[in-house]
Structures are given as C-alpha cells and as structure tokens.
C-alpha cells in the first residue's frame, strides 16, 4: 500500500548501472483474461552477450516455485522456454534488452498473488539478481458470459444442443426447453479453466431452448430455436 511508502525526489542524476529491477506494485486483471507482468532491469555488466536465464516465480522471492523459465544462448536474442506452468506463461520482453516482462494467459482466481522476476548471467560474468518486492497480481472474479450456443445433428436423425459459458467462479449451466423435464437432461461437460460446456443430448420437440449460466456474480442466458421442416402428407 502506497500510503506507507516515503516519497522521494532526485538528489543527483549520475547514471550508474547497478543491479536493479523495476516492477509495478500491482497488476489487475479479470479472470479469463490475460495479464502482463512488467519487469525491466539494469545491471553492471556492460554489453553482456553471454548465456542467460530468465525466471519468474510465484509466492516468495528466491524460494517460491518457478512458473516460467527460459534460456538464451550466447549472442542469441531468442529465449528458449524451458518451463511454462500449464502452458499459460509466455515471455513478452527481450532479456537481451533488459526486459523480462511476462504474459499470463487464461487467468483464474488462483493466479492471484506475488510474482518475482529473476535474471541469471551464466557466462564469464557469473551473476544473478531477483526482484525482492515483486509484482502483486490481483485477479478479480468475472460474471458469467455465454460464448457459444448451437444445435448440432445427433444420432438417428436427432439433434443435440451445446452451450459454452465462461466465468470465475466457473458458472453452473442449466438447459430449459419445450419438453417437460429436459432441463435435467443437461450433461455438464468438461470444464476447461474458466470455461464450462453443457450438452442437451436429444431435442425431442420444436421450440425455444434456453441455456442459463449462473455464478455468485450473476447470470446470463442465451436461446436457440429448433424448427424441423415437416413435409406435406
């Protein structure tokens, strides 16, 4: 909290290159979205071009679990990913240009917490530095949103309906329609992170079928209409 920090003014402007890392105190994002965790650094090793490793860890500096790691060969600007937890972490910055900024995809509430960037020079200039204070990622909950609703052909000339919604916490899905009791026929499909899919396996009557997604932050509805063509007798 900024109220506890002491303000400062520049006392002298000598451009010394020492180890330092610049990260914002906080980054805010909504569940399901992506967030960028900025991190830039300065170092005392002029024109360092040797091998380097960029690391991000969560929870605690120095000791917390790594969520991302990449390594750049001598002279290379490409940092080859060696670890990306759940495949959701990607380096945006160029470590050769003192930028370790990280992109986190498909945010969930559980991603909230502190993240710490670290750079290691593993060549002749054997040195490393890690941000002690880190950036606090705040992931806020998201109200439900229906992202897809569709009717597809099913077995034996029947039809089925699919509804995909997203939200955090993951929403509960329910189908309702013209046939009595078919709301209970909704099969809760595989949830992928913050996305949930429910299937209504057999649409037995023409009419409107409504998918409702609800979580603690709200609800969303979407409908699809089934009208089968009946030929003349």
């Amino acid at each position: 909290d900024a109220s506890g920090d002491l303000l400062n003014t520049e006392a002298h402007s000598a451009p010394a290159q020492r180890w330092s890392m610049q990260v914002p105190a906080e980054v805010n994002a909504e569940a399901g979205d992506a967030a960028v965790l900025p991190c830039t650094f300065t170092h005392p090793h002029r024109h360092y071009d040797g091998p380097l490793t960029a690391i991000w860890r969560s929870g605690e500096p120095y000791a917390g679990p790594q969520v991302f790691r990449c390594t750049a060969a001598p002279g290379s600007e490409l940092c080859q990913t060696a670890l990306s937890l759940h495949g959701r972490f990607r380096l945006l910055g160029n470590p050769r240009r003192n930028d370790l900024s990280l992109r986190v995809e498909r945010l969930a509430l559980a991603d909230s917490g502190r993240y710490f960037c670290r750079v290691e020079f593993t060549g002749d200039a054997h040195d490393r530095y890690e941000s002690r204070h880190g950036v606090r990622l705040r992931v806020t909950a998201a109200a439900p949103r229906i992202v897809n609703i569709s009717v597809l052909p099913g077995p034996a000339h029947a039809f089925r309906a699919l509804c995909t919604a997203e939200g955090e916490p993951p929403p509960a899905l329910a189908w309702s329609g013209p046939a009595p009791g078919n709301s209970s026929a909704a099969l809760q499909g595989q949830g992928h992170g913050y996305q949930v899919t429910a299937e209504l396996p057999a649409l037995t009557r023409d009419g409107r079928y409504t998918c409702t997604a609800a979580n603690s932050l709200g609800r969303a509805e979407a409908s699809v209409y089934l009208f089968r063509f009946h030929g003349a007798p």
Epitope: S3, D5, A25, E60
Partner: antibody
C-alpha cells in the same frame, strides 16, 4: 503515522535466551520485508537478519547464523527475533527496520538494549 | 567477507561542503544507501539508490556512486548535520552490509 516499536531487551547471562518483539503500525505490515540491525556500545551498525513478507524467506549474518531466528506474525503486525546461546559480543542496541521498495531501510524503531553479562 | 570502508572522521566548517566516501566491491554492482545517526537516536535514511533523497531530507544532502566508491555530499553544512554517517549496500548473496561509519564534526 508509520511506526516501529521494539521491546523485550534486558540483561541475560551468557548462553541464555531472549526474544525481541517489534510492533508495526501505520502501514500494511505484510507488504514489506523486515530486518533487524544491531549496534554494540560505541560501535557501528551491523545487519543481523532479513525476513520476507510471509516469513518463508530468511537471511542471517554469519555472526548469528544458527543461534538467532527471525519470524513474523502478520495477523499481529509483529516482527520477532529469538536469540539463543547468547554471547557477550551480542550485547547491543537492537533495531527493527522496514525495507522500502528500494535497497534501503526507510523506517526504524527506537531500539531495545540487550546486555549479555554474568 | 564483503566490506564497505569509510573514513573514521571528517571535519568541516559551517557553510562548507562535506564529502564522505565509502568504498567496496559491492558498490560496483549494488546501490548505496546512507544513514544519519545522532547520539542516542535511531538511524535515519538520508540517501538511497546512490542518489535519491527521501521526503523530508534537506536538498543539501546528495549522493553519487562511481566505480566502487559511493560519496555522500553535504553542501552548506549546518551544525545540526553533526552526526555519524553510515553507508550500506546489498551484497551478492542477498545479505546486507554497513560501512564502519564516519563521524562528521562541524567546526566552530
């Protein structure tokens, strides 16, 4: 206002133990690294120990490693220093300090005196 | 052990400029901070990140760091500036080190 208040100092015999406390107020305690620094009578400042936000990460000066333990209780906004196997050379005023978001200690307590003597 | 070396004492006439040096290998890689301590009181941060001044610290205090030597400069020194001054820095192993301290005497 931002404030740190140490307590728990006193006279203790060599080989004895003492626990220092540092009560923090006026800022969000759990957002900061904290440290202990000591100063022997008539001598300079000596860094003793660091502790990270949650307490999972700690560092110690070689002179106290294995004898002193730094800890914190964020629910009580309090920093601790458990001192065991005390020696005469541990006699000092002990300060707790807050590490700012840069490489420095921006807030200090008033200090508490620990005397190790038989 | 990593050390920071300061002169034990520096004297200056009122209104003149006082310079206190601090040297050590850590200063090639890490920022210096400076603390002022008056008798019977806790230290007070006067400079951090080599040259930044916390709010409430007079403009006459400034800092620099070149090579392995950091310098605290007090321009137009006043009687109230008489105190012990300590430089400090992080070290490679995430430890922290203080210089031995410099006693600043304001003559007169």
């Amino acid at each position: 206002q931002v404030q740190l208040v140490e307590s728990g100092g006193g006279l203790v015999q060599p080989g004895g133990s003492l626990r220092l406390s540092c009560a923090a107020s006026g800022f969000t305690f759990s957002n900061y690294w904290m440290t202990w620094v000591r100063q022997a009578p008539g001598k300079g400042l000596e860094w003793v120990s660091f502790i990270s936000y949650s307490g999972s990460t700690t560092y110690y000066a070689d002179s106290v490693k294995g004898r002193f333990t730094i800890s914190r209780d964020n629910s009580k906004n309090t920093l601790y220093l458990q001192m065991n196997s005390l020696r005469a050379e541990d006699t000092a005023v002990y300060y707790c300090a807050r590490e700012g978001t840069s490489s420095m200690f921006d807030v200090w307590g008033q200090g508490t005196l620990v005397t190790v003597s038989s | 052990d990593i050390e920071l070396t300061q002169p034990p004492s520096v004297s200056v006439a009122p209104g003149q400029t006082a310079r206190i040096s601090c040297s050590g290998d850590a200063l090639r890689s890490y920022y210096a901070s400076w603390y002022q301590q008056k008798p019977g009181q806790a230290p007070v941060l006067v400079i951090y990140d080599d040259n930044k001044r916390p709010s409430g610290i007079p403009e006459r205090f400034s800092g620099s760091n070149s090579g392995n030597t950091a310098t605290l400069t007090i321009s137009g020194t006043q009687a109230e500036d008489e105190a012990d001054y300590y430089c400090a820095s992080f070290t490679y192993m995430s430890d922290f080190v203080f210089g031995g301290g410099t006693k600043l005497t304001v003559l007169g």
